[in-house]
């Protein structure tokens, strides 16, 4: 079939409205003016254009803005955003949080696509750092967003932004990421009192060093086993039986169920059996009485 290029008489679009859904692909191409489309982008979202029709509208905008769309158009892209490629998005300069929110709203219910990842990357780089409002917005749409960042990227998160982080936002973070986030959280929450501080810092404790865990054990925090199991093994090993008992409070009984799993298993191997026996939980595998424990790592450090 020969490609039809002339707009049929009486079909020239005077505005972007519902009547356009009856236009065939070639009619949209021929009868809709790109400049009109750009000024009435906000209407597109309310009209159930098919994928094929959205492709035509995108093509018209691409021709009008070969160097990338202006933010006034980007903000009103609506479902047309789903048709954009990461290459398209790299041409954009998105500075408004409202624009970001509008586009994330369009993608709601979908996984974080390469398009969204590129958009976020462009936005954050443009801002220079991941400020609190941006982080608030991103974690609201994508709870796992923070854990998708590299430790290097996380280092640009200012401590003030940590207030926006919810426990579920850290569910998929690995120890390397928590190592970066924990000091920021400690700084952010430093002026809170004991029990309030523990509630806030709890989700970040997978990055806490031994000395901080020792300090917490003096504050009657009653850490739950789920949190304890996420602690760094190297941070747990130096803790004494008495310190772990204080740290866990009534939850100490849960150690029995976890005695074969890290970090509990490794911690048990480092404790004297008679110290473990004082817990009355039947934990086995500690150092038998009368044995001398040499800390070879300390010896190496001294030599």
């Amino acid at each position: 079939e020969v490609e039809k290029t002339a707009c049929p008489s009486g079909k020239k679009a005077r505005e972007i409205d519902e009547s356009l859904i009856f236009y065939k692909k070639w009619e949209l191409e021929a009868c809709v003016d790109a400049a009109l489309l750009a000024t009435q982008m906000d209407r597109v979202n309310a009209i159930p254009f098919t994928y094929e029709q959205l492709d035509v509208l995108k093509h018209k905008l691409d021709e009008l803005y070969p160097q990338g769309y202006p933010e006034s158009v980007i903000q009103h892209l609506g479902y047309l955003f789903l048709k954009m490629s990461p290459e398209d998005i790299r041409k954009w300069n998105v500075t408004s949080l409202e624009t970001l929110k509008a586009l994330l709203e369009v993608n709601k219910g979908h996984e974080m696509s390469p398009q969204v990842a590129t958009l976020i990357d462009r936005f954050v780089k443009g801002r220079g750092q991941l400020d609190k409002d941006t982080l608030d917005t991103l974690t609201a749409f994508y709870p796992g967003y923070l854990c998708s960042l590299s430790p290097e990227e996380l280092s640009s998160v200012p401590p003030s932004s940590i207030w926006a982080v919810r426990p579920q936002d850290l569910d998929t973070c690995d120890p390397r990421q928590l190592d970066v986030l924990y000091p920021k959280a400690r700084l952010a929450f430093q002026n809170m009192n004991g029990s309030e501080y523990f509630v806030k810092i709890q989700s970040f404790l997978g990055g806490a060093p031994t000395e901080d865990l020792k300090a917490l054990s003096q504050q009657n925090v009653s850490m739950d086993l789920a949190t304890f199991m996420k602690l760094r093994t190297d941070a747990v090993l130096p803790l004494t039986v008495a310190e772990v008992q204080k740290l866990l409070g009534p939850h100490v009984e849960g150690l029995k169920a976890e005695e074969r799993h890290r970090p509990v298993r490794d911690w048990i191997l480092r404790q004297r059996q008679d110290d473990l026996d004082t817990l009355g939980l039947g934990l086995q595998g500690g150092i038998p009485n009368g044995y001398l424990v040499l800390d070879l790592s300390m010896q190496e450090a001294l030599s």
Epitope: E18, P48, Y51, E52, Y79, G109
Partner: antibody, heavy 120, light 106 residues
Framework: QVQLVESGGGLVKPGGSLRLSCAAS????????MSWIRQAPGKGLEWVSY????????YYADSVKGRFTISRDNAKNSLYLQMNSLRAEDTAVYYC?????????????WGQGTLVTVSS | IQLTQSPSSLSASVGDRVTITCRAS??????LAWYQQKPGKAPKLLIY???SLESGVPSRFSGSGSGTDFTLTISSLQPEDFATYYC?????????FGGGTKVEIK
């Protein structure tokens, strides 16, 4: 919860007329495009007609064009399908469905359906 | 655009992995939805945009594909999954449905 309930189906002779109704509840009816979809006995699904949220834009499948009329009353949260000049091949269960538009167009939820039988 | 589903029917047992295909007569990007219909009931949306799971739909259902070939997979068939499944394209008007695939108990 979101609910659609069709009524008005029945037995009608070829050439006769019938008016189907669909009562919507649990959502803002006036915000959504609505559709009629039919299913002949033992057969697949056929999209018959849809109407825009305001009622200003209407679509009909070629098989019913000129014989069926879709309309809506947003004040009553109701959708209608006026069927004239009925033929034996119009025999089907007729479903009303809410159009969901999120860059694509699909149907959710559907009503329980009303059976239209065209037979002499 | 015509959608052809295959097979038109299949027999399977509880716990089986079931795959249904839908082929479009021309490329439709990812503009495809899947529905489940039980006897005497209305169709129910399972998947949209070829692979996005509708909320409330069990994760054993998954969709894949782009262009002309699409697949609905049920990873471990449950008793309540015995039904007829339809695909629907929304790449261009008129919106069309596949002929359906009936999943029966072996």
């Amino acid at each position: 919860q979101v609910q659609l309930v069709e009524s008005g189906g029945g037995l009608v002779k070829p050439g006769g007329s019938l008016r189907l109704s669909c009562a919507a509840s649990g959502f803002t009816f006036s915000d959504y495009y609505m559709s009629w979809i039919r299913q002949a006995p033992g057969k697949g699904l056929e999209w018959v007609s849809y109407i825009s949220s305001s009622g200003s834009t209407i679509y009909y499948a070629d098989s019913v064009k000129g014989r069926f009329t879709i309309s809506r009353d947003n004040a009553k949260n109701s959708l209608y399908l006026q069927m004239n000049s009925l033929r034996a091949e119009d025999t089907a269960v007729y479903y009303c469905a809410r159009n969901i538009y999120m860059g694509g167009i699909w149907f959710d939820p559907w009503g329980q359906g009303t059976l239209v039988t065209v037979s002499s | 655009i015509q959608l052809t589903q295959s097979p038109s029917s299949l027999s399977a047992s509880v716990g089986d992995r079931v795959t249904i295909t839908c082929r479009a007569s021309q490329g439709i990007s990812s503009a495809l939805a899947w529905y489940q219909q039980k006897p005497g009931k209305a169709p129910k949306l399972l998947i949209y945009d070829a692979s996005s799971l509708e909320s409330g739909v069990p994760s054993r259902f998954s969709g894949s594909g782009s262009g002309t070939d699409f697949t609905l997979t049920i990873s471990s068939l449950q008793p309540e999954d015995f039904a007829t499944y339809y695909c629907q394209q929304f790449n261009s008007y008129p919106l069309t449905f596949g002929g359906g695939t009936k999943v029966e108990i072996k």
